[in-house]
């Protein structure tokens, strides 16, 4: 028998520095977790102790903190090189700055193979990107060889900016011939490493003949066997065992997100490459693991540029940006409108001629807006200003919801109106009218939404049985502020870009902003 140790990360999202337990900015260092310096300590410890070790990343290193805003992926290549990753799969967020924003900082600089079997380049891009990413890579590990085959969510064109010259094929259809090829070349130990979410990971384990292990990402899935060491609630045991259609037991793993854990899986193979056993658990990278001094010193060196960036002007406002709780928790506020407009703008994707855009709606809990911005400071808006407005380090995500769920959400928005509670919704692409004289749960008297399948966008009444795409904070997608109906009833959830980054990009693009209160949210009394 031959034993392989797979160390894996996924959805790190720019968390190069250690973070608090909830993966936001580290405040009390003695209680902080993760970060590449701490990760390196643990990886090196395992590399020294065990003979056959692979360090893999399942995508979405890009996007999530000011590190990515400033360094645009150069930081990913630099620190992943320093940690000596063995391979990485492309995630959807690796395309956030377009194909050029992937090629130049990461694909050309990475000293490890970057993989995806289901992304095919066409047109002029085909020769430009040739060889910069691969469908698979065969790695020598100890006295054996291991094949690693990559995959990426086929929803990427709706979630990011890969452009028109990359085709995202069905994962299973694309993976099977690559695995078959490796088998014919006597590679009998094959890991599928990719970024399509836990449901697809399980399908790959079930359907792709010859895949021995699946290491996934995208859904931020936390798996654990035994008592979990922190706040994350396991979605299943680690590894999650799937019985394949040809009767094999295939371990599937994922390691939550944000570099908080290092996935640790030990696989035992027989001489024919069959998995005999698999066991392990994610390792919580808490403060009991010291940060590696040389990596930490490098982080501190790179950090200097970030501090300078946060005080630079992004753009100007010529109006007061009302982010006060007195406004945003009670009525339409122009800060809410600005943020929602930025959220929609960030998700402009012309992927179908029938649609002017794939999504037109935004909802945002008023309690998530934490500060106004005064225009009387020469109108200047900085990253620092935006960090005061959106201090929680969240993301603006894409969900699919039925109309009936949206109606419930808007009822929840005003179910205890008047108490300055955070659930009051700010909106974009939505016109809502409330009648507060009615009883809670029956206060939404009009709810019109902006069409997407139209050449001239207009507002139509919400249809209860129709499925709508909505951009919202991850806080709401996870049921925060009492929006349990969103969490329970959402049909799809894809994590998006860092909240501050979305707004800062929009302001930089617009240069001068003047958001108004324009009747998106109205109140009426009596008959309608």
């Amino acid at each position: 028998a031959w034993e392989l140790t797979i160390l894996h990360t996924n959805d790190v999202h720019s968390r190069l520095e250690q973070t608090s337990e909830d993966s936001s900015k580290c405040v009390n260092a003695s209680r902080c977790m993760g970060g590449v310096a701490r990760l390196f300590t643990k990886v090196q410890q395992i590399r020294r102790a065990e003979p056959n070790v692979l360090l893999l990343d399942a995508g979405d290193q890009y996007q999530g903190t000011i590190w990515f805003t400033v360094y645009k992926g150069a930081e990913v290549a630099h620190f992943m090189n320093a940690l000596r990753y063995d391979a990485m799969a492309l995630g959807n967020h690796e395309f956030d700055n377009g194909v050029e924003g992937l090629i130049e900082p990461l694909l050309k600089e990475a000293k490890f193979p970057i993989l995806s079997a289901n992304i095919k380049a066409k047109g002029p891009l085909a020769s430009q990107i040739s060889g910069l990413y691969l469908p698979y890579k065969v790695l020598p590990v100890g006295d054996e060889v291991v094949g690693i085959v990559g995959y990426t969510s086929k929803e990427t064109p709706f979630l990011s900016n890969p452009g028109t010259n990359l085709v995202f094929e069905d994962e299973i259809t694309a993976l099977q011939p690559e695995v078959d090829k490796l088998k014919t070349l006597n590679v009998n130990k094959i890991i599928a490493l990719g970024h399509s979410g836990f449901e697809m990971d399980k399908l790959i384990a079930q359907k792709v003949r010859g895949v021995d292990v699946v290491v996934g990402g995208h859904s931020n899935t936390f798996l654990y066997t035994g008592n979990p060491p922190s706040k994350e609630v396991p979605a299943g045991k680690y590894p999650f065992i799937v019985t394949s259609d040809d009767g094999r037991k295939v371990p599937v793993v994922q390691a939550y997100a944000f570099g908080k854990y290092l996935g640790y899986l030990k696989i035992e193979f027989d001489e024919r490459g069959n998995v005999i056993s698999s066991h392990g658990n994610p390792i919580l990278l808490n403060s009991s693991i010291p940060e590696d001094p040389s990596i930490k010193a490098d982080i501190n060196k790179w950090r200097i540029k970030l501090d300078n960036y946060s005080t630079q002007e992004l753009g100007k406002t010529i109006v007061y940006l009302d982010g006060s709780s007195q406004s945003c928790r009670f009525r339409e506020c122009n800060m809410g409108n600005l943020i929602c407009d930025a959220m929609i703008n960030n998700n402009l994707r012309h992927t179908d001629e029938m649609f002017w855009n794939h999504v037109s709606m935004c909802i945002l809990n008023g309690g998530g807006i934490r500060s106004p911005i005064d225009e009387r400071n020469n109108g200047t808006i900085t990253w620092e200003n935006l960090a005061a407005v959106l201090p929680f380090g969240g993301t603006f995500d894409l969900v699919q919801l039925k109309g009936s769920t949206l109606k419930k959400a808007f009822e929840h928005s005003v179910h205890r109106y008047g108490q300055s509670t955070g659930e009051f919704l700010q909106v974009g692409g939505i016109h809502v009218v409330y009648d507060l004289s009615r009883k809670p749960g029956d206060r939404v008297v009009k709810l019109d939404v902006l069409c997407t399948k139209c050449r001239v966008p207009s507002y139509d009444p919400l249809k209860m049985d129709e499925v709508y795409k909505v951009i919202l904070p991850n806080f709401l997608a996870n049921g925060g502020d009492g929006f349990q109906m969103i969490k329970d009833e959402l049909l799809r959830h894809d994590s998006g870009d860092q909240d501050i980054n979305v707004v800062s990009t929009y302001i930089s693009k617009m240069k001068v902003i003047y958001p108004a209160v324009e009747g998106r949210i109205k109140f009426s009394t009596g008959s309608h």
Epitope: P51, R84, S130, G131, L134, K137, V138, D143, V187
Partner: antibody, heavy 118, light 107 residues
Framework: QVQLLQSAAEVRKPGASVKVSCKAS????????MDWVRQAPGQGLEWMGD????????IYNQKFKGRVTMTTDTSRRTAYMELRSLRSDDTAVYYC???????????WGQGTTVTVSS | DIQMTQSPSFLSASVGDRVTITCKAS??????LSWYQQKPGKAPKLLIY???RLIDGVPSRFSGSGSGTEFTLTISSLQPEDFATYYC?????????FGGGTKLEIK
Amino acid sequence: QVQLLQSAAEVRKPGASVKVSCKASGYTFTDSNMDWVRQAPGQGLEWMGDINPNNGGTIYNQKFKGRVTMTTDTSRRTAYMELRSLRSDDTAVYYCARTNWDYAMDYWGQGTTVTVSS
Amino acid sequence: DIQMTQSPSFLSASVGDRVTITCKASQDINSQLSWYQQKPGKAPKLLIYRANRLIDGVPSRFSGSGSGTEFTLTISSLQPEDFATYYCQQYDVFPRTFGGGTKLEIK
């Protein structure tokens, strides 16, 4: 700068063994695999195998399996290739070559001539 | 094993010429191809890896292209120091295999 310094030329009789050494400098020895390649007189290049200095893991060309052993001594930053049961057609220049992150051979030793003759 | 077929085996050219050497793999090698230059009595020198990535310090007149099974090494304007033997090698799978070589001679 990266340098690979190989041992001097050797002459062996058929059936004997030879052990060629390759001393590395200018980089972290355990960060890269070492390959061995040979070239018979007037012929092309032939890959023999690969060793990971970190853990001693080896992958050999089946053609040489059972006759070749590759080892490393990390304290001496040296790789070794031993070939046993030598035949006259093993007469060749033997090269060690460091592999880069992509496993292409980016730095080569100067070569060690091994002559097998009765 | 994957067979690598290089052509031509011999090539006569003059200084300033543009020359192309081709390398065919018996099956798709996933862009895992390198090109080496070897001068008489010397060790091979890596010029290009991953089919088209030029090694630092190698003159830009050298370029690599191709994918799948067909690859080319192009020297845009031959210099006197370029007369040598060139080898392609696949490192997609084990065992690594080399092409038979192309000897580039002065016309």
